[in-house]
Amino acid sequence: SCNTATCVTHRLAGLLSRSGGVVKDNFVPTNVGSEAF
């Protein structure tokens, strides 16, 4: 799957949306690697 910074950001946004924003405070694009998905 795509591991560019932009892909990671969009994937994380989708994850946050589906979870209702209930995630760890440090779960942000610049802190998570592609392995988080």
């Epitope: 795509c2 910074a5 932009t6 892909c7 950001t9 946004a13 942000v28 610049t30």
Partner: antibody, heavy 119, light 107 residues
């Protein structure tokens, strides 16, 4: 309100260097990657590279590798793009841009910085 | 590098027209494509990400579709403020690359 405010226009001579700044506000600067894109007169957009402001990691377009340097000052929430060994073909508008999730999911762009390279 | 080929390079249309712009990638980019609108002297404005998702605040007349190598931006009913240049971008692979642009002009 999320804002990316860039430094003013620059005129440089061939062979010189230029450093463009991009001051971020309205969001957590270190949470999101910063991209740099340029557009020469009448040309398509061209991606220069991106930087992770949290760790300082960078990705560069090979076309600019060795000439472009992306850095950040976390304490000032400011990103920088330095381009060295300037030539006339580097005359362009340079933009910073960042896709933000919080507070608003959007792709924000700076207003652009015109760099003119002329002898 | 992945080449993004946009067509047409320019088109003339009237207010109310349905406008379709296409973008072809030189290799598979999945759905990792964005569309931008740019007006003279202004920074690009993001419209679409992940091929078909509109950013908040983007009018519903703008829609995107496609996957793999073929992508489309459609403006269902052209408005006066839509006359601009439109660019596609792939972000599936580094370096990110843009199409050559489609200038939408008033007929």
């Amino acid at each position: 309100e999320v804002q990316l405010v860039q430094s003013g226009a620059e005129v440089k001579k061939p062979g010189a260097s230029v450093k463009v700044s991009c001051k971020a506000s309205g969001y957590t600067f270190t949470d999101y990657y910063m991209n740099w894109v340029r557009q020469a007169p009448g040309q398509r957009l061209e991606w220069i590279g991106d930087i992770n402001p949290n760790q300082g990691g960078t990705n560069y377009n090979q076309k600019f590798k060795g000439r472009a340097t992306l850095t950040v000052d976390k304490s000032a929430s400011t990103a920088y793009m330095e381009l060295s060994s300037l030539r006339s073909e580097d005359t362009a508008v340079y933009y910073c841009a960042s896709i933000i999730i919080v507070p608003n999911y959007f792709d924000y762009w700076g207003q652009g910085t015109t760099v003119t390279v002329s002898s | 590098d992945i080449q993004m080929t946009q067509s047409p390079s320019s088109l003339s249309a009237s207010v109310g027209d349905r406008v379709t712009i296409t973008c072809k990638a030189s290799q598979n980019v999945d759905t990792n494509v964005a569309w931008f609108q740019q007006k003279p002297g202004k920074a690009p404005k993001s419209l679409i990400y992940s091929a078909s998702y509109r950013y908040s605040g983007v009018p519903s007349r703008f829609s995107g579709s496609g996957s793999g190598t073929d992508f489309t931006l459609t403006i269902s009913s052209l408005q006066p403020e839509d006359f601009a240049t439109y660019y596609c971008q792939q972000y599936n692979n580094y370096p990110y690359t843009f199409g050559g642009g489609t200038k939408v002009e008033i007929k």
